[in-house]
């Protein structure tokens, strides 16, 4: 959490933001909220973007003011207008691209006065794996399967049954790379699996965390995952 | 769930003062725009004016300068308003209502003001 | 200070009517308009914001419209609940301003 203030005194309103992270090729949002003011046509939301020469995205007077905008940006960013008046400046980017990560900066003006607050953007792939019993292998062996990750992640086999234990024996795992020629498919497999137990396939780089269990008895087999996005801090 | 919850009618003589109380729950009292709106019987609706709980801030609609008067106790998350020097045309109901997702989105139940002597 | 007049300033209707209400403000106010309902006795209560969107709840037979200075509220399929008064509201300069209401009478 960033918090960021204006310049001086009661000429000072308080920016917050949200360092995240934005998925290739999706919808992205860029977290900022500040003090509401309900001098609606009084507040100026300026979004910059640090090496950047042109503007992300101004809003004015209640309506978007896109003529300074970088070329980099156009078509591809929204605030939230309707939720303006009640101090979210959020910005919305259209899909993402990996040139986007960088140090974004919210400035707002209004009738009260200034602020502004820097954001971290990091920009990646990152998905939800899944992970399968492998009914083709001569073994008992299980596959974990995430469609796009970028940086390339690590993947960790874990078991409930034997906490601790270390898997890269007796699992392989490879990267291929998509077709857009950024984003890599994980497939993770792991051999040797007892039944009743619990396995989680965990992969992981500098931006998300995602996990896929799996526990496999004689009458059935659950699944559950979860992804988490690493390094939300406020400021 | 959003409430705002007002004081009871009042019956105030010409010339007196009134205070009257909105107490809010089910959001962060400090952090919103906290509005009065009147409505004279069988009229529409005026805005009187805004207090920011968190500042103190407070915005009057000019009409209603040095008639009303705005505070809040955050403590208690509630907002007071004041009116001074009462005529018969302050005869109204007086309604808070807040900016937390959007303008106007909660209403408290109204103070019924009747000045008379 | 923004002026906004609302009409008809009353109307009649029957169920399962449809019926529009506009408002028209001095000046363009960017879609920065919402649309409340009041039964009597009752505070009002919020319908439309920001022109379009429906406030939590709302029957989808409400639906809000406009742009500029010129704005409506349009229900369609009229049901027994929707006979009240209706007001605009526009928050885009200050200080807001209400319409003058609209009285929704049954036929």
């Known amino acids: 959490l960033i918090i960021g203030f204006g310049i001086s005194g009661r000429h000072s309103i308080t920016v917050t933001t949200v360092a995240s992270a934005g998925n290739i090729g999706e919808d992205g949002i860029l977290s900022c909220t500040f003090e509401p003011d309900i001098k609606l046509s009084d507040i100026v939301i300026q979004w910059l973007k640090e090496g950047v020469l042109g503007l992300v995205h101004e809003f004015k007077e209640g309506k978007d003011e896109l003529s300074e905008q970088d070329e980099m940006f156009r078509g591809r960013t929204a605030v939230f207008a309707d939720q303006v008046i009640v101090g979210n400046a959020s910005l919305r980017l259209k899909n993402v691209q990996l040139t986007d990560a960088g140090t974004y900066k919210c400035y707002i003006i209004t009738s009260k006065g200034k602020g502004n607050a820097n954001l971290e953007y990091k920009t990646g792939a990152f998905s939800m794996p899944e992970v399968n019993v492998d009914y083709n292998a001569s073994s008992e062996t299980l596959r974990c399967e995430a469609p796009r990750w970028f940086p390339q992640p690590t993947v960790v086999w874990a078991s409930q049954v034997d906490q601790g234990a270390n898997f890269s024996e007796v699992s392989n795992t490879s990267f291929e790379l998509n077709s857009e020629n950024v984003t890599m498919k994980v497939v993770s497999v792991l051999y040797n699996v007892t039944i009743n137990n619990t396995y989680s396939c965990m992969i992981e780089n500098d931006i998300a965390k995602a996990t896929g269990d799996i526990k496999v008895t004689e009458s059935e087999i659950k699944r559950r995952s979860h992804l988490q996005l690493l390094n939300s801090k406020a400021s | 769930e959003v409430q705002l919850q007002q004081s009871g009618t009042v019956l105030a003589r010409p010339g007196a003062s009134v205070k009257m109380s909105c107490k809010a729950s089910?959001?962060?009292?400090?952090?919103?725009?906290m509005h009065w709106v009147k409505q004279r019987p069988g009229q529409g609706l005026e805005w009187i004016g805004a207090?920011?709980?968190?500042?103190?801030?407070?915005s009057y609609n000019q009409k209603f300068q040095g008639k009303a008067k705005l505070t809040a106790v955050t403590s208690a998350s509630t907002a007071f308003m004041e009116l001074t020097s009462l005529t018969n045309e302050d005869s109204a109901v007086y309604y808070c209502t807040s900016t937390w997702t959007h303008y106007f989105d909660y209403w408290g139940q109204g103070t019924t003001l009747t000045v008379s002597s | 200070e923004i002026q906004m007049t609302q009409s008809p300033s009353s109307m009649s209707a029957s169920l399962g009517d449809t019926i529009t209400i506009t408002c028209q403000a001095t000046q363009d106010i960017v879609k920065s308009l919402n649309w409340y309902q009041q039964k009597p006795g009752k505070p009002p209560s919020f319908l439309i914001y920001?022109?379009?969107q429906l406030a939590e709840g709302v029957p989808s037979r409400f639906s809000g419209s406009g742009s500029g200075s010129d704005y409506s509220l349009t229900i369609s399929n009229l049901d027994s609940e929707d006979f009240a008064d209706y007001y605009c509201l526009q928050f885009y300069e200050f200080p807001p301003t209400f319409g003058g209401g609209t009285k929704l009478e049954i036929k």
């Open positions: 920001y022109t379009t």
């Open positions: 207090i920011y709980p968190g500042k103190s801030d407070t």
């Open positions: 089910g959001y962060t009292f400090s952090s919103y725009w």
